[in-house]
């Protein structure tokens, strides 16, 4: 069964910077990745980035840069402007559309005990949805 993992990481050098890493474990090729916060895409979540392997990438504030790390994983850099966007308590969701598997989504957040600069372990897929 395909699986999606999500890691949320606070940068050691800049405590206001966070990075969300997401990956797809499974066969098939990725056709689209959507990253949202506050819940799954289309279910109360707010879109932060969309990445397409050929058509490009797009991010929305407070996301700074969305990029492919491998053909099946992405990273999204975020700038926390303070109290208005408390990333430390936020859920981030990544939805991977792949052919021929369909769509798979998982969510994760920064562990409460996270030290700056330490990456959270792969989230044990609290939300996994196949469309």
């Amino acid at each position: 069964t395909p699986e999606v993992w999500v890691q949320v990481q606070m940068e050691a050098t800049e405590l206001s910077s966070f990075t969300v890493h997401c990956g797809f474990l499974g066969p098939g090729s990725i056709s689209l990745v959507t990253v949202s916060w506050g819940g799954p895409d289309g279910a109360g979540g707010t879109k932060l980035a969309v990445l397409h392997p050929e058509l490009g990438t797009r991010q929305w504030a407070p996301a700074r840069q969305a990029r492919w790390e491998t053909q099946s994983s992405i990273s999204l850099a975020l700038e926390d402007s303070g109290a208005s966007s408390p990333f430390a308590n936020t859920t981030f969701c990544c939805k991977f559309a792949s052919f021929p598997e369909g769509s798979w989504e998982s969510c994760g957040s920064l562990p409460p005990s996270s030290d700056p600069g330490l990456s959270a372990p792969p989230t044990p897929v609290p939300i996994l949805r196949a469309d």
Partner: antibody
């Protein structure tokens, strides 16, 4: 056939505002973001920003924040751009352009609206 | 913001010739580079995206290449309808930025 029909040329005085329109047809209006692009005479293209027709959310090029305001009227499939506090630097042709997912390529373009700022 | 630098700014060529236009990005944009063609008095039209994918109805005499920060658009055997201006644009996040343009004129 996809069409983006823009409003006609504008001659406006310095300090005034202008609102130009872009009526979309031939596709589902909410499937494409609407970008606006400036082309000064004989010059290159500058992305002003775009608007999500589903909810009116906007993204702006920092350079045009405070200068341009982008809106949509879903019921008439029309996008609008208002330019304020106009100066001669704002004299240009302005294009609307529709962008499909992930909203970074301009797939369809309007014919352009010429704005001339002169006293 | 990502700066896009195009060269040459203008180019004169004859029908049947082959020309190459180059575009440089100020940072790595992977393969996310598009080209637009604009004919005199008309709107720009998307020609190429993802460095080398031609949009529908674009003739095969057009070809794109490059990656990272260096890209080029090559037009083989120029036809009369190819003359006009060409602009590169990255599609790697916002703000979207364009190159300064290359005006391709008939010699």
């Amino acid at each position: 056939e996809v069409q983006l029909q823009q409003s006609g040329p504008e001659l406006v005085k310095p300090g005034a505002s202008v609102k130009i329109s872009c009526k979309a047809s031939g596709y589902t209006f909410t499937d494409y973001y609407m970008s606006w692009v400036k082309q000064s005479h004989g010059k290159s293209l500058e992305w002003i920003g775009d608007v999500n027709p589903n909810n009116g959310d906007t993204s702006y090029n920092q350079k045009f924040k405070g200068k341009a305001t982008l809106t949509v009227d879903k019921s008439s499939s029309t996008a609008y751009m208002e330019l304020r506090s106009l100066t001669s630097e704002d004299s240009a042709v302005y294009y609307c352009a529709a962008s499909g997912l992930p909203y970074v390529l301009m797939d369809y373009w309007g014919q352009g609206t010429s704005v001339t700022v002169s006293s | 913001d990502i700066q896009m630098t195009q060269s040459p700014a203008s180019l004169s060529a004859s029908v049947g010739e082959t020309v190459t236009i180059t575009c440089r990005a100020s940072e790595n944009i992977n393969s996310y580079l598009a080209w637009y063609q604009q004919k005199q008095g008309k709107s720009p039209q998307l020609l190429v995206y993802n460095t080398k994918t031609l949009t529908e109805d674009v003739p095969s005499r057009f070809s794109g290449s490059g990656s990272g920060t260096q890209f080029s658009l090559k037009i083989n055997s120029l036809q009369p309808e190819d003359f006009g201006s060409y602009y590169c644009q990255h599609h790697y996040g916002t703000p979207l930025t364009f190159g300064g343009g290359t005006k391709l004129e008939l010699k």
